[in-house]
């Protein structure tokens, strides 16, 4: 949950308000209470945003882009509150807003700078392309341009590919990293400096497991304490890589504490889940269960990927029958 907007106070009657795309914000303005209150909000000194005088709104010449998106705190005007409630901000709303307040006593003018940020939750994906393995950190919509950093075994990596596409109001960014043949752990951080919001993706490959047919395998998946906050909503998904694509075996939603299992041989330990341990068991292994198993723990602030490689070998009996 984020605040409606946050203010940064700067000198000369000017404040900076930071809002999020499509969310509501408040442009603050206060004055010394008095009678005969007149309030005019303008954008870039040209466009009429909102006018109030003689006890009511006068929106006849309001710029169409603000229609049905602005209101004042009418019960608070007599107490010196001229703040503007602004609905569903877009990146086109960025800029300088001027609040003119006139009363029987004085006239004051306040300036508010509105900055709008976008940060749709990023994702970290693990992909196989032919014989290569890639980690991809991507964010579908972000503004302003974020800072993306990669680390390998906690050491920053200078090589940082960024595929960027810009739309009218935000960027879409992919940052792929080739990790073919690597057993290292990787971390990708995407930071939106305006919204002061950081997302981290972490990828860990576990040692390969060799199992015999008909046995069961236990695969560990425990969140790293640095990122994990049990109070925050998150989702855990176990998937298996089959011919280049992942199929979901099971998932768990923390908000509802629901577990959905798509593979009858898959089991989760409820006791362990309550202790934030999402390790799983797969029973009665067969040869086709060989492959990569991915545990994905995701929230708004992080994605933790754990990869297990399982090799299922024929049992002695099966081998002797052949």
């Amino acid at each position: 949950i984020f605040p409606l907007a946050f203010f940064i106070y700067v000198p000369m009657n000017e404040q900076i308000v930071i809002g999020r795309l499509d969310e509501d914000i408040i442009l603050p303005s206060s004055f010394e209470r008095g009678s005969e209150v007149v309030i005019h909000w303008k954008y870039q000194d040209s466009y009429k945003v909102h006018s109030y005088y003689k006890g009511s709104d006068h929106l006849e010449s309001q710029d169409p882009r603000y229609a049905n998106r602005t209101s004042l705190f009418y019960n608070e005007i007599q107490n010196g509150n001229a703040s503007l409630f602004f609905r569903r901000v877009s990146l086109l709303d960025e800029g300088i807003y001027t609040c003119y307040v006139g009363t029987a006593i004085q006239v004051i003018t306040n300036k508010v700078v509105l900055k709008v940020g976008v940060f749709l939750t990023p994702v970290m994906k693990y992909e196989k392309r032919n014989t290569n393995s890639f980690l991809i950190c991507s964010v579908l919509s972000v503004y302003p341009r974020p800072i993306i950093t990669w680390k390998m075994d906690n050491t920053p990596i200078s090589e940082n590919n960024m595929e960027e596409t810009g739309s009218l109001d935000s960027f879409s960014i992919n940052s792929p990293l080739n990790i073919t043949g690597s057993n290292s752990s990787y971390e990708c951080t995407i930071e939106n400096s305006l919204l002061k919001q950081t997302w981290t993706g972490r990828w860990t490959m576990k040692d390969g497991l060799h199992k015999m047919q008909s046995e069961h395998v236990s695969l560990s998946c425990q969140p790293v304490n640095d990122y994990f906050s049990p109070n925050q909503d998150f989702k855990v998904t176990w998937s298996r890589m089959k011919s280049g694509t992942f199929s979901v075996l099971a998932y768990y939603l923390s908000s509802s504490q629901n577990t959905i299992i798509n593979e009858s041989r898959f089991s989760w330990n409820k006791e362990l889940i309550n202790q934030s341990d999402f390790s799983m068991n797969l029973m009665d292994l067969n040869l086709s269960d060989s492959g990569e198993y991915l545990c994905n723990i995701s929230s708004d602030e992080y994605t933790l990927l754990t990869i297990h490689t399982v090799h299922v070998e024929p049992s002695q009996e099966t081998a002797s029958h052949n």
Epitope: V38, H40, Y53, K54, G55, S61, Y100, G102, V107
Partner: antibody, heavy 121, light 107 residues
Framework: QVQLVESGGGVVQPGRSLRLSCAAS????????IHWVRQAPGKGLEWVAV????????YYADSVRGRFTISRDNSKNTLSLQMNSLRVEDTAVYYC??????????????WGQGTLVTVSS | DIQMTQSPSTLSASVGDRVTITCRAS??????LAWYQQKPGKAPKLLIY???SLESGVPSRFSGSGSGTEFTLTISSLQPDDLATYYC?????????FGQGTKLEIK
């Protein structure tokens, strides 16, 4: 102290033009709406026009709409009234008057001393 | 346009008298009414705004009342300096309109 000084009045023939000016001092001119109000000799007061503090809005009385144009120069603290197609009934003392605030309130807190316009053939 | 009608047109009173001037609007103007005083050869001066609010610097013997369509200006104790013409003005909507004026004479 607040001062409004009108100038530009005089005698003019019907159908001709005249430009009145109002010089403001003693307050932040760009914060206030300014009106023109006129008074025919021996008659009552008649509101003529208003221009808002930022020049964004201008309103006129029906009797002058289309003939008179109000304007302001906030950098020079001056207000103007361009009067075209003048009629005998436009003869009056023309006052510039400051609004309570932006121009939206519509009453007159400070007045100039007035300038006389006489339209006569 | 909203018509404003003042009565009486002329009023003669003595120093110390309580004087009342009435103003009627042709339609409701809430409390958006101002009163002005104009002395001979001078510009008008604001006395009252919003029907009953006394403008700063105006003597307290002046008061206003009313709302809707009926308004009054009262001078509680007439002074020689109050010789003037008094105008009401509605500022509910454009075009702003004045009453025809009430000329106050001192007996």
């Amino acid at each position: 102290q607040v001062q409004l000084v009108e100038s530009g009045g005089g005698v003019v023939q019907p159908g001709r033009s005249l430009r009145l000016s109002c010089a403001a001092s003693g307050f932040t001119f760009s914060d206030y709406g300014i009106h023109w109000v006129r008074q025919a000799p021996g008659k009552g007061l008649e509101w003529v026009a208003v221009i808002w503090y930022d020049g964004s809005d201008k309103y006129y009385a029906d009797s002058v709409r289309g003939r008179f144009t109000i304007s302001r120069d906030n950098s020079k603290n001056t207000l103007s009234l361009q009067m075209n197609s003048l009629r005998v009934e436009d003869t009056a003392v023309y006052y510039c008057a400051r609004d309570r605030s932006s121009g939206a309130m519509g009453y007159f807190v400070y007045w100039g001393q007035g300038t006389l316009v006489t339209v006569s053939s | 346009d909203i018509q404003m009608t003042q009565s009486p047109s002329t009023l003669s009173a003595s120093v110390g008298d309580r004087v009342t001037i009435t103003c009627r609007a042709s339609q409701s103007i809430s409390s958006w009414l101002a009163w002005y005083q104009q002395k001979p050869g001078k510009a008008p001066k604001l006395l009252i705004y919003k029907a009953s609010s006394l403008e700063s610097g105006v003597p307290s013997r002046f008061s206003g009342s009313g709302s809707g369509t009926e308004f009054t200006l009262t001078i509680s104790s007439l002074q020689p300096d109050d010789l003037a013409t008094y105008y009401c003005q509605q500022y509910q909507s454009y075009s702003y309109t004045f009453g025809q004026g009430t000329k106050l004479e001192i007996k």
